[in-house]
């Protein structure tokens, strides 16, 4: 998280020759995993299974449509971000099982835990892009008819990914491995040591750019969109709208604990009881944030079932129905039926 993973150590898993005697007391240690760590492990396991399979399926469904369907491009990129993050889970899982011992080396320490932050920034920037797209579809349909195309969507995604990488760099740079003398253990974490101000700056930037600002802008954006759609008769675009609102809401719900504890820890003294308590919850907060990596496919399936009445179709076709919308070609321009429907409404309203 924002500071070194100050977790209660244990040395029951070391070789006998490595230890004094398994009954030797060591400052504030425990031979068992704490409850928050056990909960984190359960969440990690579920997220990994659902996230890898679910996002792989979403990637498979949307990849074929991404050349021509803009919604498919958005959902494909979201799924790739989630899928990448899920790949780090087995290693994070192993580390927690070993009482936060990190045997994977410095490079892995810098890269793998940074994936969840990359996912956070990529997801929120992609969600902001999707939301801007929904906003434009409702309020600027003529502009969309002229300019909204797959090429522009891919450029927007590339910008989102680039910015996400840029915002992940500070945490990546400060990640280090530390080998503790006793109990013998290697820890992976962020160490700002002398630079408490920089730690706070990183935490504040993460909170503002990765949480508060998107929360504010997306809330405003969807308030306008929902007001507009509720004031018109239902159109097919509400399907995607409901899915996107659900995805956005889940993003903020599951990132909240991580962001709150992160900002608190950056302002607390590392030896304070509150800091140590929050640090014990670190893995649980990370695992809770990781739910974002598997929740989207679940939302798509639930939404698909809602639209189908009941699950009559196969899973891929159900997902295809939610994530892609048939393209209607008019004047050599490719746009989704939701665009056309919304535009028709706009014309009627004027």
């Amino acid at each position: 998280m924002n500071s070194f993973n100050y977790t209660t150590p244990d040395y029951g898993h070391y070789d006998d020759k490595d230890t004094l005697d398994l009954n030797t007391p060591v400052d504030k240690t425990s031979n068992t995993l704490r409850v928050p760590d056990i909960l984190a492990l359960v969440i990690f396991a579920v997220v990994f299974l659902v996230g890898v399979l679910g996002n792989a399926l979403v990637v498979w469904v949307t990849a074929f449509e991404a050349k021509r369907t803009i919604n498919a491009i958005w959902f494909l990129n979201l799924a790739v971000a989630d899928f990448l993050s899920c790949l780090a889970l087995p290693i994070l899982f192993t580390s927690i099982v070993q009482h936060h011992h990190w045997p994977f080396g410095g490079a892995a320490c810098s890269i793998l835990p940074s994936l969840i932050l990359l996912n956070m920034y990529a997801s929120i920037l992609l969600l902001a892009t999707i939301s801007a797209d929904r906003f434009l579809l409702v309020f600027k349909p003529i502009w969309c008819q002229n300019f909204r195309g797959a090429g522009l969507a891919w450029i927007a995604c590339a910008v989102a990914w680039g910015l996400a990488l840029l915002l992940t760099i500070p945490s990546f740079l400060y990640r280090v491995v530390r080998e503790e003398y006793f109990p013998p253990k290697v820890l992976c974490g962020v160490d700002y040591s002398h630079d408490k101000r920089r730690e706070r700056a990183v935490a504040i930037v993460r909170l503002v750019l990765g949480f508060l600002w998107p929360l504010l802008t997306l809330t405003i954006c969807y308030t306008f969109i929902l007001l507009r759609t509720w004031s018109r008769r239902a159109t097919r675009s509400t399907k995607t709208l409901k899915v996107v609102v659900a995805v956005v809401a889940s993003f903020f719900i599951f990132w909240l604990p991580y962001q709150v504890t992160g900002i608190m820890m950056s302002f607390l003294e590392p030896s304070s009881p509150t800091f140590l308590l929050l640090n014990k919850l670190d893995s649980l907060c990370v695992s809770f944030a990781y739910i974002n990596c598997c929740i989207n496919p679940i939302i798509y399936v639930v939404a698909g079932q809602g639209f189908q009445g009941r699950l009559r179709k196969s899973l891929p076709s159900l997902l295809r129905n939610v994530l892609t919308e048939e393209s209607v070609v008019r004047e050599s321009k490719s746009f989704t039926r939701s665009t056309v429907d919304t535009m028709a409404q706009k014309t009627q309203a004027v």
């Epitope: 100050y6 030797t24 003398y181 030896s271």
Partner: antibody
Framework: QVQLQQSGAELAKPGASVKLSCKAS????????MHWVKQRPGQGLEWIGY????????KYNQKFKDRATLTADKSSSTAYMQLSSLTYEDSAVYYC??????????????????WGQGTTLTVSS | DVVMTQTPLSLPVSLGDHASISCRSS???????????LHWYLQKPGQSPKLLIY???NRFSGVPDRFSGSGSGTDFTLKISRVEAEDLGVYFC?????????FGSGTKLELK
């Protein structure tokens, strides 16, 4: 009372090896870890490594890993440090230091409570 | 490796004076269990070092209460409230949180 008696001064040639000893008395030898520390004339202290006499487990400072070998003889309550491929930079006073596994409110082998008197090693051709 | 920086390198005092020695580490010394494993040793001329303070602020047996330690994370201080003749020598701070264990370069407490 606790005593750590170290062997006398050593004179060695560059490239040679020496074996320094540290005889413990006044406590149970296997219940304490033994560390070795180097001090060059007028300079600070440098940690070499430790041995757990009970199990024979050793841990070294990477800087000394290839040239220092720590051993312990439980029967004579003596810890040894062998230094090989000596260079002029190895000229220093070498201390053995005992580490308690618990003391007061502290549990774990974290500090040196007793030190030997030191062995002076001079590397000269 | 953790670099331990002691200041000042030399501290001239008069008997009965207060003395303060600072020790700063290049990395945080907070162990994963919340403890700071920072200790202070005194080495008198021609002798081996002796433990004064362990774990930042705990006096070792036989150490007078005029010695006190404080600090956390990367900044630590040893204070001597009224310097006596037997306190003169070189003071070393040492950390045993991370491998390799490291020592400060020493602060020589001497008479003015």
């Amino acid at each position: 009372q606790v005593q750590l008696q170290q062997s006398g001064a050593e004179l060695a040639k560059p490239g040679a090896s020496v074996k320094l000893s540290c005889k413990a008395s006044g406590y149970t030898f296997t219940s304490y870890w033994m560390h070795w520390v180097k001090q060059r004339p007028g300079q600070g202290l440098e940690w070499i490594g430790y041995i757990n006499p009970s199990s024979g487990y050793t841990k070294y400072n990477q800087k000394f890993k290839d040239r220092a070998t720590l051993t312990a003889d439980k029967s004579s309550s003596t810890a040894y440090m062998q230094l090989s491929s000596l260079t002029y930079e190895d000229s220093a006073v070498y201390y053995c230091a005992r580490v308690p596994l618990s003391y007061g409110s502290s549990y774990g082998p974290y500090f040196f409570d007793y030190w030997g008197q030191g062995t002076t090693l001079t590397v000269s051709s | 490796d953790v670099v331990m920086t002691q200041t000042p390198l030399s501290l001239p005092v008069s008997l009965g004076d207060h003395a303060s020695i600072s020790c700063r580490s290049s990395q945080s010394l907070i162990h994963s269990n919340g403890n700071n494993y920072l200790h202070w040793y005194l080495q008198k001329p021609g002798q081996s070092p002796k433990l004064l303070i362990y774990k930042v602020s705990n006096r070792f047996s036989g150490v007078p209460d005029r010695f006190s330690g404080s600090g956390s994370g990367t900044d630590f201080t040893l204070k001597i409230s009224r310097v006596e003749a037997e306190d003169l020598g070189v003071y070393f701070c040492s950390q045993s949180t991370l491998v390799p264990l490291t020592f400060g370069s020493g602060t020589k407490l001497e008479l003015k």
